[in-house]
Amino acid sequence: LRQEDFPPRIVEHPSDLIVSKGEPATLNCKAEGRPTPTIEWYKGGERVETDKDDPRSHRMLLPSGSLFFLRIVHGRKSRPDEGVYVCVARNYLGEAVSHNASLEVAILRDDFRQNPSDVMVAVGEPAVMECQPPRGHPEPTISWKKDGSPLDDKDERITIRGGKLMITYTRKSDAGKYVCVGTNMVGERESEVAELTVLE
């Protein structure tokens, strides 16, 4: 034991992340100690493999100790990057473990669970269209377009609640092609077109 040697301590802990599939990401970790500690990452109790183990890996252990993802990998079933991570710094005097950091993957599927259907109403009658957007994380918000332009939801006749578009009192000018739009940090998805026909 050399007098100036000391055990590791974490000086920068990783933070929770939410990242879009396919995007790069970094979980930070910095440790002090003498001798300089080695850093390893663990996810759910298992050691995370990096480019140090397999040069084809999409995860890189940076000289600072941070874990860099060239792209976040996330499939329909296999989800190797999502989870709770810790970094562990070690030297011969001991080890230090960082705080937990969760890495969540933002996704937005392609397929609408329910596409809106064509509606035919008489002038003055209420009209309702309904859609269920694709599954996503974070949960997608829903908006509507009419004839390719965002719907004017300042019109007090129009209410958007959940996946429902309600027009309490239809006018001839409400007729047109409607599309439901699901949006989150990944991007947006548009439903199939539904036609609203307003009969005189």
Partner: antibody, heavy 118, light 105 residues
Framework: EVQLVQSGAEVKKPGASVKVSCKAS????????MHWVRQAPGQGLEWMGW????????EFPQKFQGRVTMTRDTSITTAYMDLSRLRSDDTAVYYC???????????WGQGTMVTVSS | DIVMTQSPSSLSASVGDRVTITCRAS??????LNWYQQKPGKAPKLLIY???SLQYGVPSRFSGSGSGTDFTLTISSLQPEDFATYYC???????FGGGTKVEIK
């Protein structure tokens, strides 16, 4: 190195069972689904099902339900496929394959030849 | 069940030829389509994932295209080591095409 190493060839009698193992190394075992695929002599590839090593959840096509069992031992990063009530047409090479986060089978075992003969 | 139909089932070609193999799904599978190469006595090898993405280490003469129900694998200039059997696979619910054997003319 990321690899899947399977158990050796088996010869079984009709009506018996066979258990094939697939040892994973070089990656986080619980992060990737494991599939089993078989190939009869001179034939194409046939999917037999998957196991999620994280929780042991499984799914099989109708054809194999009730006859195939898939298990895993996370402590030794090994997946197993058990096929019961063997028939001569189960003679095939059986492969384990890792499903990547890109929804494709990126790593395959070397295959295990199972011969069913009386 | 989603049925994958590959064509042709076999073809003869010469080194340097451009080779095209098609795969049709019985219903839309978006871009959940992968291509594999298999040589006798060996395990299949992933070539293309997500319809058009080239797997790490695979030569750029291999390319994939298509979405929905119709997909294509193209080998721009056939090399001696490319004589093998090729399989498409849909990962929407998982099933394989019947295979295409590429033989020397």
């Amino acid at each position: 190195e990321v690899q899947l190493v399977q158990s050796g060839a088996e010869v079984k009698k009709p009506g018996a069972s066979v258990k094939v193992s697939c040892k994973a190394s070089g990656y986080t075992f619980t992060g990737y689904y494991m599939h089993w695929v078989r190939q009869a002599p001179g034939q194409g590839l046939e999917w037999m099902g998957w196991i999620n090593p994280k929780d042991g959840d499984t799914e099989f096509p109708q054809k194999f339900q009730g006859r195939v069992t898939m298990t895993r031992d996370t402590s030794i990063t090994t997946a197993y496929m058990d096929l019961s009530r063997l028939r001569s047409d189960d003679t095939a090479v059986y492969y384990c394959a890792r499903e990547s986060g890109d929804d494709a089978f990126d790593i395959w075992g070397q295959g295990t030849m199972v011969t069913v003969s009386s | 069940d989603i049925v994958m139909t590959q064509s042709p089932s076999s073809l003869s070609a010469s080194v340097g030829d451009r080779v095209t193999i098609t795969c049709r799904a019985s219903q839309s599978i978006s871009s959940y389509l992968n291509w594999y190469q298999q040589k006798p006595g060996k395990a299949p090898k992933l070539l293309i994932y997500a319809a058009s993405s080239l797997q790490y280490g695979v030569p750029s003469r291999f390319s994939g295209s298509g979405s929905g129900t119709d997909f294509t694998l193209t080998i721009s200039s056939l090399q001696p080591e490319d004589f093998a059997t090729y399989y498409c696979q849909q990962s929407y619910s998982t099933s394989f095409g019947g295979g295409t054997k590429v033989e020397i003319k």
